[in-house]
Amino acid sequence: NKILVKQSPMLVAYDNAVNLSCKYSYNLFSREFRASLHKGLDSAVEVCVVYGNYSQQLQVYSKTGFNCDGKLGNESVTFYLQNLYVNQTDIYFCKIEVMYPPPYLDNEKSNGTIIHVKGKHLCPSPLFPGPSKP
């Protein structure tokens, strides 16, 4: 049995930040689980991890330098990413593993979410500013 994952097909990060919600066909309440977000078609970069263990506090971290956090719902984990760069525009996949209670479960690979990071464009100064007033 595999857990099904639903993600938005595309998100735009306007202020270099985005919230990506991973919705699962499984209730995570009172489960030991590891939810993660992966970057790239081959999911080679593990962007963020949210680890939950029953009623204990969530452990949230990135080993790859992303500024991330995560919020748990009964059947979802929302990943918060900040300080994204334009060159981090890519496809991102949600992954979920349930370690306890048995049996171990993980997800069917989702369709992923394309996160398009829009750069902050500053208005250029005019080449020839108007005459200054005396």
């Epitope: 452990q59 949230v60 971290y61 995560g70 919020k71 918060y80």
Partner: nanobody
Framework: EVQLLESGGGLVQPGGSLRLSCAAS????????MEWVRQAPGKGLEWVSS????????YYADSVKGRFTISRDNSRNTLYLQMNSLRAEDTAVYYC??????????????WGQGTLVTVSS
């Protein structure tokens, strides 16, 4: 070099308020869960509160729930603890602590020198 510098402690009457600050440097502050812990005179270390890297989750000890609020400003590399409705039993040295990443809360690798909070009439 990692540094955590607490401030804002002092003498306050029961029912009063204080806001503690912790200025962090020497590490990537937005990448870590941060904690407040305290040590009352003659007692052991007690966990008070924690906040996940971007502030999405906050946790509190039962003894302070509803009275204390943890927050952080990642642009300023600063952790805060707003303490309201203070009681005599809140008297302690308060330390901010940086979590060892990947291990979750209650595991600290650095903490500050502390700031003393005294609640007395």
């Amino acid at each position: 070099e990692v540094q955590l510098l607490e401030s804002g402690g002092g003498l306050v009457q029961p029912g009063g308020s204080l806001r503690l600050s912790c200025a962090a440097s020497g590490f990537t502050f937005p990448g870590y869960t941060m904690e407040w812990v305290r040590q009352a005179p003659g007692k052991g270390l007690e966990w008070v509160s924690s906040i996940t890297p971007l502030g999405a989750n906050t946790y509190y000890a039962d003894s302070v729930k509803g009275r204390f609020t943890i927050s952080r400003d990642n642009s300023r590399n600063t952790l805060y603890l707003q303490m309201n409705s203070l009681r005599a039993e809140d008297t302690a040295v308060y330390y901010c602590a940086k979590d060892i990443r990947y291990t979750g809360t209650y595991n600290f690798d650095y903490w500050g020198q502390g700031t003393l909070v005294t609640v007395s009439s």
